[in-house]
Amino acid sequence: CKAMHVAQPAVVLASSRGIASFVCEYASPGKATEVRVTVLRQADSQVTEVCAATYMMGNELTFLDDSICTGTSSGNQVNLTIQGLRAMDTGLYICKVELMYPPPYYLGIGNGTQIYVIDPEPCPDSDF
């Protein structure tokens, strides 16, 4: 019996508008009806929560209104989008999946996605 596996891309480049999207996919060892997905940022040895959402299988993924994340779910796959990123937010973003219900609980953690964010160059003043 293998432990739950979580897959996510190794590297993602954020758009010039500071938006990064990636897929988090998990192989479920049980028949979960309630799943929690958390995005964590690891910098040095510090881990901070970026956003989290709980969803019922077959239903949409809903983050809090003030969250910088949005997402959609399809089976054991979650499409995550993080917005409002700046160059200083470059780092390793880890997808954590928890099968919350029914018992037993299971934990799965991806290896992380390195998100690179490059701040856009300011537009030069144009002389007319």
Epitope: C1, E34, E49, M100, P104, Y106, L107
Partner: antibody, heavy 119, light 107 residues
Framework: QVQLVESGGGVVQPGRSLRLSCAAS????????MHWVRQAPGKGLEWVAV????????HYADSVKGRFTISRDNSKNTLYLQMNSLRAEDTAVYYC????????????WGQGTLVAVSS | DIQMTQSPSSLSASVGDRVTITCRAS??????LNWYQQKPGKAPKLLIY???SLQSGVPSRFSGSGSGTDFTLTISSLQPEDFATYYC?????????FGPGTKVDIK
Amino acid sequence: QVQLVESGGGVVQPGRSLRLSCAASGFTFSSYGMHWVRQAPGKGLEWVAVIWYDGNNKHYADSVKGRFTISRDNSKNTLYLQMNSLRAEDTAVYYCARGDMLTGYYGYWGQGTLVAVSS
Amino acid sequence: DIQMTQSPSSLSASVGDRVTITCRASQSISSYLNWYQQKPGKAPKLLIYAASSLQSGVPSRFSGSGSGTDFTLTISSLQPEDFATYYCQQSYSTPFTFGPGTKVDIK
């Protein structure tokens, strides 16, 4: 700094009830799974229960299922363990512990509170 | 439920000895394995998390290895303050079981 302080332990007769509390400080309480772990005199560590984040999901060891209830008040940063129908085998030091945000290990523990079930 | 076994259950060693404790899970738990040290009358103290990561402030003589079902805690050179009981624990699935413990005492 992170602190966990248990209270509510004591001597109680079999069949009676007791409620333990764990006051947490120094971290964002609602972002963490919170656990109770116990240790009977001269024995090893036994996981008792966990309550997740907003308090909607709880899991229990078979030995306490149906008798113990774990709860939390995120507005008060407090974890609880309601223990009903207590038995002699529930005699133990009860610890609250914070599960790590990433892999769930117990990096922080309370000092423990002793529950003695005796007639 | 995932069962955790530890060996040996106790061992006698001298200061400076290299000590190895093994922990086995009844099914794969990936790397969600933690090691704790406990001294009489005290709360447990985390030593190693995620099988091989050293907790901040823990001396480097402690190390952990393994994944899947088989794990090891090694103390490279036993110090007087290391005489204690050591527990492994899995944080992969509920119930979050502990091993029965290994008591390390003075030879």
